[in-house]
Interface confidence: medium
Protein backbone atom coordinates (compact mmCIF):
# COMPACT_ATOMS: atom_id res chain seq x y z
CA UNK A 1 0.00 0.00 0.00
CA UNK A 2 2.80 2.39 0.90
CA UNK A 3 4.47 1.82 -2.51
CA UNK A 4 1.22 2.76 -4.21
CA UNK A 5 0.88 5.91 -2.11
CA UNK A 6 4.50 6.86 -2.83
CA UNK A 7 3.91 6.32 -6.52
CA UNK A 8 0.81 8.51 -6.49
CA UNK A 9 2.72 11.23 -4.68
CA UNK A 10 5.53 11.01 -7.19
CA UNK A 11 3.12 11.16 -10.12
CA UNK A 12 1.62 14.41 -8.97
CA UNK A 13 4.64 16.15 -7.48
CA UNK A 14 8.14 14.93 -8.24
CA UNK A 15 7.45 12.92 -11.34
CA UNK A 16 6.04 14.94 -14.24
CA UNK A 17 6.09 13.71 -17.83
CA UNK A 18 9.48 13.54 -19.55
CA UNK A 19 10.36 15.74 -22.50
CA UNK A 20 11.44 14.26 -25.84
CA UNK A 21 13.33 16.50 -28.24
CA UNK A 22 15.97 16.61 -30.95
CA UNK A 23 18.25 19.43 -32.06
CA UNK A 24 17.31 18.47 -35.60
CA UNK A 25 13.61 18.47 -36.45
CA UNK A 26 13.79 18.73 -40.23
CA UNK A 27 15.81 15.88 -41.73
CA UNK A 28 16.56 14.18 -45.02
CA UNK A 29 16.45 10.45 -45.57
CA UNK A 30 19.61 8.75 -44.34
CA UNK A 31 20.35 11.49 -41.83
CA UNK A 32 21.63 10.63 -38.35
CA UNK A 33 19.76 12.18 -35.44
CA UNK A 34 20.10 12.18 -31.67
CA UNK A 35 16.93 12.16 -29.60
CA UNK A 36 17.07 13.46 -26.04
CA UNK A 37 14.66 12.28 -23.37
CA UNK A 38 14.96 14.38 -20.24
CA UNK A 39 13.22 14.70 -16.92
CA UNK A 40 12.95 17.55 -14.44
CA UNK A 41 13.79 15.28 -11.53
CA UNK A 42 17.59 15.15 -11.39
CA UNK A 43 17.90 13.13 -8.18
CA UNK A 44 16.11 9.93 -9.20
CA UNK A 45 17.62 7.22 -11.35
CA UNK A 46 15.20 6.93 -14.23
CA UNK A 47 14.84 4.21 -16.85
CA UNK A 48 14.05 5.80 -20.20
CA UNK A 49 12.48 3.87 -23.08
CA UNK A 50 12.02 5.14 -26.61
CA UNK A 51 9.08 4.10 -28.77
CA UNK A 52 8.18 4.72 -32.41
CA UNK A 53 4.43 4.32 -32.66
CA UNK A 54 4.05 1.18 -30.54
CA UNK A 55 7.47 -0.29 -31.32
CA UNK A 56 9.98 -0.30 -28.46
CA UNK A 57 13.31 0.90 -29.82
CA UNK A 58 15.59 0.95 -26.82
CA UNK A 59 16.06 1.54 -23.13
CA UNK A 60 18.69 3.26 -21.03
CA UNK A 61 19.15 4.40 -17.47
CA UNK A 62 20.11 7.85 -16.36
CA UNK A 63 20.30 10.18 -13.40
CA UNK A 64 20.48 13.93 -13.91
CA UNK A 65 21.39 13.57 -17.58
CA UNK A 66 19.05 13.19 -20.55
CA UNK A 67 18.91 9.80 -22.21
CA UNK A 68 20.37 10.00 -25.70
CA UNK A 69 19.13 7.70 -28.45
CA UNK A 70 21.04 7.78 -31.74
CA UNK A 71 19.01 6.88 -34.82
CA UNK A 72 19.23 7.07 -38.58
CA UNK A 73 16.09 8.21 -40.40
CA UNK A 74 16.17 6.10 -43.56
CA UNK A 75 12.49 5.59 -44.44
CA UNK A 76 9.40 7.80 -44.44
CA UNK A 77 7.72 5.77 -41.69
CA UNK A 78 10.69 6.48 -39.39
CA UNK A 79 9.65 10.13 -39.16
CA UNK A 80 7.55 9.22 -36.11
CA UNK A 81 5.70 9.78 -33.98
CA UNK A 82 8.21 9.00 -31.22
CA UNK A 83 7.42 8.84 -27.53
CA UNK A 84 9.64 8.53 -24.49
CA UNK A 85 8.70 6.71 -21.29
CA UNK A 86 10.32 7.60 -17.98
CA UNK A 87 10.04 4.95 -15.29
CA UNK A 88 10.99 4.75 -11.62
CA UNK A 89 10.05 1.47 -9.93
CA UNK A 90 6.35 1.06 -10.76
CA UNK A 91 5.74 4.68 -11.77
CA UNK A 92 5.91 5.61 -15.42
CA UNK A 93 5.05 8.68 -17.47
CA UNK A 94 5.11 9.28 -21.23
CA UNK A 95 6.30 12.32 -23.14
CA UNK A 96 4.31 14.09 -25.81
CA UNK A 97 4.71 12.77 -29.35
CA UNK A 98 7.67 13.99 -31.40
CA UNK A 99 7.87 13.69 -35.17
CA UNK A 100 10.53 14.59 -37.68
CA UNK A 101 9.74 16.33 -40.94
CA UNK A 102 11.44 14.51 -43.79
CA UNK A 103 12.53 16.86 -46.54
CA UNK A 104 14.18 15.94 -49.84
CA UNK A 105 17.30 18.04 -50.34
CA UNK A 106 17.38 20.50 -53.20
CA UNK A 107 19.52 19.57 -56.17
CA UNK A 108 21.85 22.10 -57.77
CA UNK A 109 19.70 24.69 -59.51
CA UNK A 110 20.08 25.71 -63.13
CA UNK A 111 20.53 29.40 -63.86
CA UNK A 112 19.29 30.83 -67.16
CA UNK A 113 19.96 34.38 -68.25
CA UNK A 114 18.16 36.47 -70.82
CA UNK A 115 19.45 39.94 -71.71
CA UNK A 116 17.89 42.77 -73.69
CA UNK A 117 20.69 45.07 -74.81
CA UNK A 118 20.08 48.74 -75.52
CA UNK A 119 22.63 51.40 -76.37
CA UNK A 120 23.08 52.36 -72.76
CA UNK A 121 21.64 49.56 -70.66
CA UNK A 122 21.35 45.87 -70.24
CA UNK A 123 17.99 44.56 -69.02
CA UNK A 124 18.80 41.23 -67.42
CA UNK A 125 16.31 38.55 -66.46
CA UNK A 126 17.63 35.72 -64.29
CA UNK A 127 15.75 32.43 -63.99
CA UNK A 128 16.67 29.80 -61.38
CA UNK A 129 15.13 26.36 -60.96
CA UNK A 130 15.96 23.31 -58.83
CA UNK A 131 14.15 20.34 -60.36
CA UNK A 132 14.32 18.19 -57.19
CA UNK A 133 13.78 18.91 -53.55
CA UNK A 134 10.83 19.38 -51.22
CA UNK A 135 8.87 22.59 -51.68
CA UNK A 136 8.86 25.41 -50.81
CA UNK A 137 12.27 26.36 -52.19
CA UNK A 138 13.87 29.72 -51.51
CA UNK A 139 16.01 31.14 -54.31
CA UNK A 140 18.57 33.92 -53.96
CA UNK A 141 20.48 35.50 -56.85
CA UNK A 142 24.11 36.59 -56.61
CA UNK A 143 26.29 38.90 -58.67
CA UNK A 144 30.03 38.52 -58.10
CA UNK A 145 29.30 36.58 -54.88
CA UNK A 146 27.09 39.34 -53.45
CA UNK A 147 23.36 38.74 -52.98
CA UNK A 148 21.38 41.02 -55.28
CA UNK A 149 17.89 39.72 -54.52
CA UNK A 150 15.84 38.88 -51.47
CA UNK A 151 14.96 35.21 -50.92
CA UNK A 152 12.24 34.35 -53.43
CA UNK A 153 9.96 31.56 -52.19
CA UNK A 154 8.47 29.17 -54.71
CA UNK A 155 5.70 26.82 -53.65
CA UNK A 156 5.51 25.15 -57.06
CA UNK A 157 8.09 23.71 -59.43
CA UNK A 158 8.48 26.98 -61.33
CA UNK A 159 11.64 28.99 -61.79
CA UNK A 160 12.28 32.01 -59.63
CA UNK A 161 12.73 35.17 -61.66
CA UNK A 162 14.67 38.32 -60.94
CA UNK A 163 15.07 41.36 -63.15
CA UNK A 164 17.74 43.99 -63.06
CA UNK A 165 18.94 46.79 -65.28
CA UNK A 166 22.62 47.62 -65.58
CA UNK A 167 24.53 50.33 -67.32
CA UNK A 168 26.65 48.65 -69.94
CA UNK A 169 29.42 47.39 -67.69
CA UNK A 170 33.08 47.86 -68.30
CA UNK A 171 34.00 44.50 -66.82
CA UNK A 172 32.75 40.92 -66.67
CA UNK A 173 30.09 39.99 -64.16
CA UNK A 174 29.42 36.56 -62.75
CA UNK A 175 25.94 35.43 -61.75
CA UNK A 176 24.80 32.42 -59.79
CA UNK A 177 21.80 31.42 -57.75
CA UNK A 178 21.25 29.55 -54.51
CA UNK A 179 18.42 27.11 -53.78
CA UNK A 180 17.47 26.26 -50.22
CA UNK A 181 14.51 24.57 -48.54
CA UNK A 182 13.67 23.77 -44.92
CA UNK A 183 16.71 21.53 -44.47
CA UNK A 184 19.01 23.49 -42.15
CA UNK A 185 22.56 24.17 -43.30
CA UNK A 186 21.88 22.68 -46.70
CA UNK A 187 21.98 24.96 -49.72
CA UNK A 188 23.04 24.30 -53.29
CA UNK A 189 24.37 26.69 -55.92
CA UNK A 190 24.11 26.84 -59.67
CA UNK A 191 27.11 26.88 -61.92
CA UNK A 192 28.25 30.47 -62.40
CA UNK A 193 27.31 32.25 -65.61
CA UNK A 194 29.69 34.99 -66.73
CA UNK A 195 28.42 38.03 -68.60
CA UNK A 196 31.04 39.58 -70.87
CA UNK A 197 31.97 43.22 -70.40
CA UNK A 198 30.74 44.66 -73.71
CA UNK A 199 27.72 44.23 -75.99
CA UNK A 200 27.69 43.14 -79.62
CA UNK A 201 28.74 39.66 -80.59
CA UNK A 202 30.29 39.06 -77.20
CA UNK A 203 26.89 38.98 -75.51
CA UNK A 204 25.66 35.43 -76.09
CA UNK A 205 22.52 35.94 -73.97
CA UNK A 206 21.46 39.20 -75.61
CA UNK A 207 18.26 39.69 -77.57
CA UNK A 208 18.90 42.39 -80.17
Amino acid sequence: RKAVLDCEAMKTNEFPSPCLDSKTKVVMKGQNVSMFCSHKNKSLQITYSLFRRKTHLGTQDGKGEPAIFNLSITEAHESGPYKCKAQVTSCSKYSRDFSFTIVDPVTSPVLNIMVIQTETDRHITLHCLSVNGSLPINYTFFENHVAISPAISKYDREPAEFNLTKKNPGEEEEYRCEAKNRLPNYATYSHPVTMPSTGGDSCPFCLK
Epitope: L50, G58, Q60, D61, A67, N70, L71
Partner: antibody
Protein backbone atom coordinates in the same frame (compact mmCIF):
# COMPACT_ATOMS: atom_id res chain seq x y z
CA UNK B 1 22.23 -16.69 -34.04
CA UNK B 2 24.13 -13.56 -32.97
CA UNK B 3 27.87 -13.93 -33.60
CA UNK B 4 30.91 -11.67 -33.40
CA UNK B 5 34.16 -12.86 -34.97
CA UNK B 6 37.40 -10.90 -34.53
CA UNK B 7 40.33 -11.18 -36.92
CA UNK B 8 43.55 -9.37 -37.77
CA UNK B 9 45.56 -10.16 -34.64
CA UNK B 10 49.13 -11.42 -34.72
CA UNK B 11 52.72 -10.48 -34.04
CA UNK B 12 53.71 -6.87 -34.64
CA UNK B 13 56.90 -4.95 -33.89
CA UNK B 14 56.93 -2.06 -31.40
CA UNK B 15 55.97 1.15 -33.18
CA UNK B 16 53.97 -0.81 -35.76
CA UNK B 17 50.30 -0.67 -36.67
CA UNK B 18 47.52 -3.23 -36.89
CA UNK B 19 43.87 -3.17 -37.90
CA UNK B 20 41.50 -5.58 -36.22
CA UNK B 21 38.11 -6.49 -37.70
CA UNK B 22 34.96 -7.69 -35.99
CA UNK B 23 32.44 -9.32 -38.32
CA UNK B 24 28.90 -9.36 -36.95
CA UNK B 25 26.15 -11.74 -38.00
CA UNK B 26 22.64 -12.52 -36.81
CA UNK B 27 21.76 -8.88 -36.17
CA UNK B 28 21.94 -5.49 -37.84
CA UNK B 29 25.03 -3.59 -36.79
CA UNK B 30 23.35 -0.25 -37.57
CA UNK B 31 21.09 -0.57 -34.50
CA UNK B 32 23.78 -1.28 -31.90
CA UNK B 33 26.71 0.59 -30.49
CA UNK B 34 29.87 -1.56 -30.40
CA UNK B 35 32.92 -1.55 -28.14
CA UNK B 36 36.42 -2.94 -28.08
CA UNK B 37 37.75 -4.37 -24.81
CA UNK B 38 41.16 -5.90 -24.23
CA UNK B 39 42.73 -8.24 -21.70
CA UNK B 40 46.46 -8.57 -21.19
CA UNK B 41 47.62 -12.09 -20.24
CA UNK B 42 46.45 -12.82 -16.68
CA UNK B 43 45.19 -9.26 -16.25
CA UNK B 44 41.91 -7.32 -15.97
CA UNK B 45 39.45 -6.45 -18.69
CA UNK B 46 40.15 -2.98 -20.04
CA UNK B 47 37.64 -0.89 -22.02
CA UNK B 48 39.20 0.71 -25.11
CA UNK B 49 36.31 2.57 -26.67
CA UNK B 50 32.82 2.57 -28.16
CA UNK B 51 31.31 3.61 -31.48
CA UNK B 52 27.69 4.69 -31.45
CA UNK B 53 25.00 3.93 -34.02
CA UNK B 54 25.66 7.33 -35.59
CA UNK B 55 29.44 6.82 -35.62
CA UNK B 56 30.29 9.02 -32.65
CA UNK B 57 33.35 7.51 -30.98
CA UNK B 58 34.34 7.49 -27.30
CA UNK B 59 37.71 6.33 -26.01
CA UNK B 60 39.44 5.56 -22.74
CA UNK B 61 41.85 8.40 -21.96
CA UNK B 62 44.89 6.17 -22.53
CA UNK B 63 43.62 5.08 -25.98
CA UNK B 64 42.95 8.53 -27.45
CA UNK B 65 45.23 9.35 -30.36
CA UNK B 66 46.61 5.84 -30.92
CA UNK B 67 43.42 3.81 -31.31
CA UNK B 68 40.59 4.49 -33.75
CA UNK B 69 37.26 2.67 -33.96
CA UNK B 70 35.22 2.71 -37.16
CA UNK B 71 32.39 0.72 -38.65
CA UNK B 72 31.05 -0.31 -42.05
CA UNK B 73 27.37 -1.13 -41.69
CA UNK B 74 27.17 -2.42 -45.27
CA UNK B 75 29.73 -5.10 -44.36
CA UNK B 76 28.33 -5.51 -40.82
CA UNK B 77 31.89 -5.02 -39.56
CA UNK B 78 33.58 -2.91 -36.86
CA UNK B 79 37.28 -2.06 -36.97
CA UNK B 80 39.98 -1.13 -34.47
CA UNK B 81 42.98 0.66 -35.93
CA UNK B 82 45.97 0.55 -33.58
CA UNK B 83 49.05 2.71 -34.17
CA UNK B 84 52.40 3.19 -32.41
CA UNK B 85 52.02 -0.15 -30.68
CA UNK B 86 53.97 -0.92 -27.51
CA UNK B 87 54.83 -4.11 -25.65
CA UNK B 88 52.17 -3.28 -23.05
CA UNK B 89 49.50 -3.41 -25.79
CA UNK B 90 49.99 -7.19 -25.94
CA UNK B 91 46.56 -8.59 -25.13
CA UNK B 92 43.52 -10.48 -26.35
CA UNK B 93 41.25 -7.94 -28.04
CA UNK B 94 37.49 -8.50 -27.88
CA UNK B 95 34.71 -6.75 -29.68
CA UNK B 96 31.44 -6.60 -27.78
CA UNK B 97 27.90 -5.56 -28.65
CA UNK B 98 26.04 -3.22 -26.35
CA UNK B 99 22.76 -4.83 -25.41
CA UNK B 100 20.36 -1.92 -25.72
CA UNK B 101 19.48 -0.51 -29.13
CA UNK B 102 20.51 2.97 -30.28
CA UNK B 103 22.42 3.89 -27.13
CA UNK B 104 25.98 3.84 -25.80
CA UNK B 105 24.77 3.66 -22.18
CA UNK B 106 24.56 -0.09 -21.83
CA UNK B 107 26.20 -3.39 -20.92
CA UNK B 108 27.65 -6.13 -23.14
CA UNK B 109 25.30 -8.96 -24.01
CA UNK B 110 27.45 -10.45 -26.78
CA UNK B 111 31.24 -10.86 -27.08
CA UNK B 112 33.52 -12.19 -29.78
CA UNK B 113 36.00 -14.97 -29.07
CA UNK B 114 38.89 -12.49 -29.07
CA UNK B 115 42.02 -12.12 -31.19
CA UNK B 116 45.55 -12.12 -29.72
CA UNK B 117 47.86 -9.21 -30.49
CA UNK B 118 51.52 -9.66 -29.54
CA UNK B 119 53.81 -6.62 -29.67
CA UNK B 120 57.41 -7.77 -29.61
CA UNK B 121 60.66 -7.32 -31.48
CA UNK C 1 36.69 8.54 -14.99
CA UNK C 2 35.05 6.12 -12.58
CA UNK C 3 37.22 3.39 -11.00
CA UNK C 4 35.79 0.04 -9.97
CA UNK C 5 37.35 -1.88 -7.05
CA UNK C 6 36.51 -5.55 -6.61
CA UNK C 7 37.12 -7.66 -3.54
CA UNK C 8 38.38 -10.15 -2.81
CA UNK C 9 40.73 -10.58 -5.76
CA UNK C 10 40.48 -14.34 -5.26
CA UNK C 11 38.63 -16.78 -3.05
CA UNK C 12 38.46 -20.53 -2.55
CA UNK C 13 35.16 -22.27 -1.96
CA UNK C 14 33.47 -25.65 -2.17
CA UNK C 15 30.49 -26.83 -4.17
CA UNK C 16 27.31 -25.82 -2.32
CA UNK C 17 28.91 -22.81 -0.61
CA UNK C 18 27.34 -19.36 -0.64
CA UNK C 19 29.76 -16.96 -2.29
CA UNK C 20 29.68 -13.16 -2.09
CA UNK C 21 31.76 -10.80 -4.24
CA UNK C 22 31.72 -7.03 -3.75
CA UNK C 23 32.37 -4.16 -6.13
CA UNK C 24 32.83 -0.52 -5.19
CA UNK C 25 32.59 2.45 -7.55
CA UNK C 26 34.71 5.56 -6.97
CA UNK C 27 31.55 7.68 -7.33
CA UNK C 28 27.82 7.03 -7.41
CA UNK C 29 26.66 5.17 -10.52
CA UNK C 30 23.06 4.53 -9.47
CA UNK C 31 22.37 0.99 -10.62
CA UNK C 32 24.36 1.18 -13.87
CA UNK C 33 26.34 -1.95 -13.12
CA UNK C 34 26.75 -5.33 -14.81
CA UNK C 35 28.41 -8.59 -13.71
CA UNK C 36 30.22 -11.02 -16.02
CA UNK C 37 31.65 -14.53 -15.68
CA UNK C 38 34.80 -15.49 -17.56
CA UNK C 39 36.37 -18.91 -17.91
CA UNK C 40 40.01 -19.44 -19.07
CA UNK C 41 40.45 -18.89 -22.80
CA UNK C 42 36.83 -17.73 -23.21
CA UNK C 43 35.07 -14.41 -23.64
CA UNK C 44 33.16 -12.93 -20.70
CA UNK C 45 29.49 -13.86 -20.34
CA UNK C 46 26.84 -11.45 -19.04
CA UNK C 47 25.18 -12.56 -15.80
CA UNK C 48 23.44 -9.49 -14.35
CA UNK C 49 22.70 -5.96 -15.54
CA UNK C 50 21.16 -2.88 -13.90
CA UNK C 51 22.78 -4.16 -10.69
CA UNK C 52 20.12 -6.79 -10.00
CA UNK C 53 18.43 -7.94 -13.24
CA UNK C 54 19.29 -11.52 -14.19
CA UNK C 55 20.21 -12.02 -17.84
CA UNK C 56 17.98 -14.49 -19.68
CA UNK C 57 19.25 -18.07 -19.35
CA UNK C 58 21.41 -17.39 -16.28
CA UNK C 59 20.64 -19.70 -13.32
CA UNK C 60 18.68 -18.15 -10.44
CA UNK C 61 21.43 -19.02 -7.94
CA UNK C 62 23.15 -15.83 -9.20
CA UNK C 63 21.82 -12.57 -7.80
CA UNK C 64 22.97 -8.97 -7.66
CA UNK C 65 22.21 -6.14 -5.28
CA UNK C 66 23.30 -2.62 -4.41
CA UNK C 67 23.12 0.89 -5.79
CA UNK C 68 25.15 4.07 -5.64
CA UNK C 69 28.72 2.97 -4.93
CA UNK C 70 28.45 -0.48 -3.31
CA UNK C 71 27.38 -3.63 -5.15
CA UNK C 72 27.31 -7.35 -4.43
CA UNK C 73 27.19 -10.50 -6.56
CA UNK C 74 25.97 -13.56 -4.69
CA UNK C 75 26.06 -17.20 -5.76
CA UNK C 76 23.64 -18.92 -3.37
CA UNK C 77 24.94 -22.45 -3.90
CA UNK C 78 28.18 -22.80 -5.80
CA UNK C 79 28.13 -25.37 -8.63
CA UNK C 80 31.15 -27.01 -10.35
CA UNK C 81 30.61 -24.92 -13.49
CA UNK C 82 30.74 -21.68 -11.44
CA UNK C 83 34.51 -21.83 -10.83
CA UNK C 84 35.63 -18.87 -12.92
CA UNK C 85 36.62 -15.21 -12.70
CA UNK C 86 33.88 -12.63 -12.10
CA UNK C 87 34.03 -9.00 -13.23
CA UNK C 88 31.86 -6.01 -12.43
CA UNK C 89 31.43 -3.22 -14.98
CA UNK C 90 29.94 0.25 -14.71
CA UNK C 91 28.53 2.02 -17.72
CA UNK C 92 28.06 5.74 -17.91
CA UNK C 93 27.18 8.37 -20.44
CA UNK C 94 26.55 12.08 -20.74
CA UNK C 95 25.85 14.32 -23.70
CA UNK C 96 29.60 14.59 -24.30
CA UNK C 97 31.03 11.28 -23.16
CA UNK C 98 30.35 7.60 -22.78
CA UNK C 99 32.57 5.09 -21.07
CA UNK C 100 32.74 1.73 -19.37
CA UNK C 101 34.94 0.68 -16.46
CA UNK C 102 35.69 -2.85 -15.31
CA UNK C 103 36.74 -4.12 -11.92
CA UNK C 104 39.88 -6.23 -11.85
CA UNK C 105 38.08 -9.48 -11.24
CA UNK C 106 37.51 -12.03 -8.51
CA UNK C 107 38.84 -15.52 -9.19
CA UNK C 108 36.75 -18.28 -7.61
CA UNK C 109 38.73 -21.53 -7.21
CA UNK C 110 38.08 -24.94 -5.66
CA UNK C 111 38.93 -25.17 -1.98
Amino acid sequence: EVQLVESGGGLVQPGGSLRLSCAASGFSLSSHAMSWVRQAPGKCLEWIGTISTIDTTYYASWAKGRFTISRDNSKNTVYLQMNSLRAEDTAVYYCARLSELYTTNSYYSRWGQGTLVTVSS
Amino acid sequence: DIQMTQSPSSLSASVGDRVTITCQASESIGSLLAWYQQKPGKAPKLLIYRASTLESGVPSRFSGSGSGTDFTLTISSLQPEDFATYYCQSYHYSSSSSYAAFGCGTKVTVL
